[in-house]
Amino acid sequence: GSVPPMVNVTRSEASEGNITVTCRASSFYPRNITLTWRQDGVSLSHDTQQWGDVLPDGNGTYQTWVATRICQGEEQRFTCYMEHSGNHSTHPVPSGNSHHHHHHHH
């Protein structure tokens, strides 16, 4: 059967006026997954995103990540979109004082 991913969005200061947002998916099976950043619901172009490899996490499941740099103050426009085994979810960027949002999807 399939195991849905845990999805976790974090933010970190990049350069002046910019932040890096990272979306991590972990503990999922099978390994096929779509993970992408969207702006206003539209996927960002590939050249503005960085992806990690889909790697085994040691429990028979997998993990991966995608990151992009955005302008501070524009966070509300951006979401991380995940598709796995016919299910999907959307994950917002956490506010500045909250660095971790975990969601398990079934």
Epitope: D40, S45, R77, H88, S89, T90, H91
Partner: antibody
């Protein structure tokens, strides 16, 4: 086949409110944003706002923020646009549209004509 | 707000001729955020070209798009009768999302 089917034409008095619906089918409703756009007679297109039905986030064009409410009912795959304090210049065709993978508006509803007249 | 200015407002051409439509932005936008739509009388707009130069599904190859920065162009290499319509450019780079005022391509 992706379809966005909107409610029928409305005639309203100045000061009244109107609520237009947009029923989506042919795709997973919560996987794409629903945008609202209007077009006054003989005029161009004007973006009103959008909703992300999965998380319920709404972004408005500031020009409309005080008079517009966008909502979505995921159980019926339907989005709604409510416009209050109507005035004659709100007479327009109101369109819903779906966000695409690579563009803001990839599928459109058939439009709903709202006429504001005393 | 990014203002998109389309020119000309009206283009009068005959079938078979080449149409060149311009869209000028009030400030620079990434080519990833510039799209074109076609609208025929009494119909909803239809996505024509996304991200400056990519044809939407079902759009004939006579349509093409180009540009960068503040200047973008939609070209129809040889007009067919069904191409006579209004064309809008749209930017998705910054809020509010905005459209150009449209260029009407009419039969001469």
């Amino acid at each position: 086949e992706v379809q966005l089917v909107q409610s029928g034409a409305e005639v309203k008095k100045p000061g009244a409110s109107v609520k237009v619906s947009c029923k989506a089918s042919g795709y997973a409703f919560t996987s794409n944003n629903i945008y609202w756009v209007r077009q006054a007679p003989g005029q161009g297109l004007e973006w009103i706002g959008y909703i992300d039905p999965y998380i319920g986030r709404i972004i408005y064009n500031q020009q409309f923020k005080d008079r517009v409410t966008i909502t979505a009912d995921t159980s019926t795959s339907t989005a709604y646009l409510e416009l209050s304090s109507l005035r004659s210049e709100d007479t327009a065709v109101y369109y819903c549209s779906r966000s695409g993978e690579r563009s803001n508006f990839d599928y459109w509803g058939q439009g709903t004509l709202v006429t504001v007249s005393s | 707000e990014i203002v998109l200015t389309q020119s000309p407002a009206t283009l009068s051409l005959s079938p078979g001729e080449r149409a060149t439509l311009s869209c000028s932005a009030s400030s620079s936008i990434s080519s990833n955020y510039l799209h074109w739509y076609q609208q025929k009388p009494g119909q909803s707009p239809r996505l024509l070209i996304y991200r400056t130069s990519n044809l939407a599904s079902g759009v004939p190859a006579r349509f093409s798009g180009s540009g960068s920065g503040t200047d973008y162009t939609l070209t129809i290499s040889s007009l067919e009768p069904e191409d006579f319509a209004v064309y809008y450019c749209q930017q998705g780079g910054s809020l509010p999302l905005t459209f150009g005022q449209g260029t009407k391509v009419e039969i001469k």
